[in-house]
């Protein structure tokens, strides 16, 4: 695994190839989760943020940007989206929490907690996932589309198997999250594919 | 196999400062945290602090933050524990541990150290 | 700083007793603990981790449950190997902290 604290993932253009593929061996299903990361682009289409398949499972779990100001959390193939007032183009550092026995899930947007919203009320996440970082799946670890592609830069990406209280959340947006046993910036196990580059997080 | 080897046992003055080796082999050293943990005669396992080797960010316990410095040197696969001001109770058989592959426990662990402070 | 409190702090057994130690976080860590297993003059060996599963190598007999504040190791049929003493510790918030110990000792 490797240290990545103070370096991003940089997609420097549109494709349908390039992405990095994040390496976890979970291994039970998920009731509930806390993802955080910071995240950078001047893309005002829409795109992928984080995209979670499993095997016969499309946007199990996915984080997507459907314009400026609008975020949706995928669960197991149902949407919610929040929105919130925000600046373009603008660093942005995302946290999203789902708990599958309330079936909230709740967007922090820069330290500030959107409106909650409900969905899929007693689901479970399916374990061993492919997860990708510049690209949305359509299949497990593939079928990627030009037009959901990422450009820009990710990076202090975290992932908890619980619901972080606020003052963690903070505490990820200030740049000292706890321990991730999920997946974890300063210990990530992760594969790129195609032209992506590592650089210095110049941005926060 | 993948090991840890220590460096040997201390006897210190109080005041003065003890650096422990901790030598890795049987695995790529860059990349995995190494943490130190300190026992106490009779006592329980204390978290002093880690560090990883390849990015040098470390993170230590409040505890010992203004008195230990954890640093790693790639080119001999060695971190090193460095534990000034010390007194007595520092007395202790202090461990080197590597990180897991994926989670935040210990799954190697050194021979222990035994740093004895006093006067 | 979380306190990880382990009971019974000592234990006298037979082999072959199934026997029992707990642990309770000061607050929830979740499922992020672990259990180690340390013989004298020795360094602690890795037996659980995310509080239910079992390290690479080690025997079935040793098991772990709990969640939030509250944690078990179980040991289903003692053999003398594992007359020692265990930890329990949690990494679900800097610093690392352990529990106290419980030695397991021959009735």
């Known amino acids: 695994h490797t240290d990545l604290s103070g370096k991003v993932f940089v997609f420097p253009r549109e494709s349908v190839t390039d992405h990095v593929n994040l390496i976890t061996p979970l291994e039970k299903p998920l009731q509930n989760f806390t993802l955080c990361f910071r995240a950078y682009s001047d893309l005002s289409r829409a795109y992928s943020l984080f995209s979670y398949n499993t095997q016969g499972r499309d946007n199990e779990l996915l984080v997507y940007k459907e314009r400026v100001g609008e975020y949706s959390l995928y669960i197991g193939r149902h949407k919610v989206t929040s929105k919130v007032i925000e600046k373009f183009p603008a660093p942005v550092h995302i946290c999203v929490s789902w708990e599958s026995s309330s079936g909230i899930a709740e967007f922090w947007i820069n330290g500030t907690p959107l409106v909650k919203k409900g969905l899929r009320q007693g689901y479970f996440v399916e374990a061993q996932p492919k997860i990708v970082l510049g690209q949305e799946q359509d299949s497990y670890g593939g079928k990627f589309d030009r037009s959901q592609s990422f450009v820009g830069e990710i990076g202090d990406l975290y992932m908890w198997d619980s619901v972080l209280p606020p003052e963690n959340i903070l505490s990820a947006y200030q740049g000292t999250p706890l321990p991730a046993n999920i997946l974890d910036w300063q210990a990530l196990n992760y594969e790129i594919r195609g032209y992506v580059i590592i650089k210095p997080l110049v941005w926060v | 196999q993948v090991q840890l080897v220590q460096s040997g046992a201390e006897v210190k003055k109080p005041g003065s400062s003890v650096k422990v080796s901790c030598k890795a082999s049987?695995?790529?050293?860059?990349?995995?945290?190494m943490h130190w943990v300190r026992q106490a005669p009779g006592q329980g396992l204390e978290w002093m602090g880690m560090i990883h080797p390849n990015s040098v960010n470390t993170n230590y316990n409040e505890k010992f933050k203004s008195r230990v410095t954890i640093t790693a040197d790639k080119s001999t696969s060695t971190a090193y524990m460095e534990l000034s001001s010390l007194r007595s109770e520092d007395t202790a058989v202090y461990y080197c541990?590597?990180?897991?592959?994926?989670?935040?426990?210990?799954?190697?662990w050194g021979q222990g150290t035994l740093v004895t402070v006093s006067s | 700083d979380i306190q990880m409190t382990q009971s019974p702090s000592s234990l006298s057994a037979s082999v072959g007793d199934r026997v029992t130690i707990t642990c309770k976080a000061s607050q929830n860590v979740n499922s992020n603990v672990a259990w180690y297993q340390q013989k004298p003059g020795k360094a602690p060996k890795l037996l659980i981790y995310?509080?239910?599963y079992r390290y690479s190598g080690v025997p079935s007999r040793f098991s772990g449950s709990g969640s939030g504040t509250d944690f078990t190791l179980t040991i289903s049929s003692l053999q003398p190997e594992d007359f020692a003493t265990y930890y329990c510790?949690?990494?679900?918030?800097?610093?690392?902290?352990f529990g106290q110990g419980t030695k397991l000792e021959i009735k």
């Open positions: 510790q949690q990494c679900n918030n800097y610093p690392f902290t």
């Open positions: 049987g695995y790529t050293f860059t990349s995995y945290w």
């Open positions: 541990a590597r990180r897991n592959d994926y989670y935040w426990y210990f799954d190697v």
């Open positions: 995310s509080a239910s």
